[in-house]
């Protein structure tokens, strides 16, 4: 038979020969021959390979550098890389999470729509009419204006997106 031009799934072609790929978590030591199967070895302690492969070296696990605000979210195995996330109050600057930045705060007049996570920043929204925020915060939502009526009071000073209303006593008509 003619030598192959393509091989089966999880195989690779070398020297007119189909050889089995190494399974995830293992690296290639020697190619197969017609008599001997591909020789593979497990990756070391801090290494991984996440696909069927013919790599002669395993990849190093990602290092979650605390100096960059990183910490380990999920420890790597021989088949998976380490997943980093950011310390409390910080979030990743990219999908690869190679460094962290402090969560942004929402300025007065804006409230937190979505609290930041290790991988996403704070999402702020302007306080709509009837709501206010008078602080710069990464957690505080817009608060509703105080309802003077329910306290049997009247509005003495209108609220804004940054300030609450000011309530005061009602002027009573003297008899």
């Amino acid at each position: 038979p003619e030598p192959p031009t393509a091989c089966r799934e999880k195989q690779y072609l070398i020297n007119s020969q189909c050889c089995s790929l190494c399974q995830p978590g293992q690296k290639l030591v020697s190619d197969c021959t017609e008599f001997t199967e591909t020789e593979c070895l497990p990756c070391g302690e801090s290494e991984f390979l996440d696909t069927w492969n013919r790599e002669t070296h395993c990849h190093q696990h990602k290092y979650c550098d605390p100096n960059l605000g990183l910490r380990v979210q999920q420890k790597g195995t021989s088949e998976t890389d380490t997943i980093c996330t950011c310390e409390e109050g910080w979030h990743c600057t990219s999908e690869a999470c190679e460094s962290c930045v402090l969560h942004r705060s929402c300025s007065p007049g804006f409230g937190v729509k979505q609290i930041a996570t290790g991988v996403s920043d704070t999402i702020c929204e302007p306080c709509p009419v009837g709501f206010f925020s008078n602080v710069s915060s990464a957690f505080e939502k817009c608060h509703p204006w105080t309802s003077c009526e329910t306290k049997d009071l009247v509005v003495q000073q209108a609220g804004t997106n940054k300030t609450d209303v000011v309530c005061g006593p009602q002027d009573r008509l003297r008899a």
Partner: antibody
Framework: QVQLVESGGGVVQPGRSLRLSCAAS????????MHWVRQPPGKGLEWVAV????????YYGDSVKGRFTISRDNSKNTLYLQMNSLRVEDTAVYYC??????????????????WGQGTTVTVSS | QAVPTQPSSLSASPGASASLTCTLR?????????IYWYQQKPGSPPQFLLR?????????GSGVPSRFSGSKDASANAGLLLISGLQSEDEADYYC?????????FGGGTKLTVL
Amino acid sequence: QVQLVESGGGVVQPGRSLRLSCAASGFTFSSHGMHWVRQPPGKGLEWVAVIWYDGSNEYYGDSVKGRFTISRDNSKNTLYLQMNSLRVEDTAVYYCTRGGGHWNYEGHYYGMDVWGQGTTVTVSS
Amino acid sequence: QAVPTQPSSLSASPGASASLTCTLRSGINVGSSRIYWYQQKPGSPPQFLLRYTSDSDKLQGSGVPSRFSGSKDASANAGLLLISGLQSEDEADYYCMIWHSSAVVFGGGTKLTVL
């Protein structure tokens, strides 16, 4: 290490039967095609038969077709050669040999690398 | 079955080179054939030396010295076993082997004498 050990040889009369066995060790027997090759006294090598790694196919040399049957038991890591209607010209040392692995493209069309020490079959009246 | 043709004997001196031929009959193209070579010493089973298909597709047997190499002579439709730096322990019978029509065929063998 890789080892093939043949057994079952002996002296037998023409027309009788004999079954040879070959015990394999040191490798994944079920991954390899296996052959029987014989060598008459003072003569060259003659191929007898091959069986695929999974037993799905067998081929035979012209001189033994219809009389000899190659088989294998992968659970016992053992290769067999059932020899019927033996003839004087079947007298030879019979070698069990390892063929190509199943990972090959058409792996059964590859050669043989490991040989046993052989077992002697003498057919004589 | 078509048996490859090998010269029955060959003599050479220690340190010299020897070229053993395995001629295929017409109809079997040496160019596309895998040719296997085996060495057999008296009282021992054959040992796999090498398989040669082309310079980019060859296989050396485990522990076989690089003094043993394969080649082909397309014009003679023959496979070649080349042994350089002959040593006394190279004295043995040498067999070539091919697949043809779903059967294995061995050459008749060459007896190499190292004088």
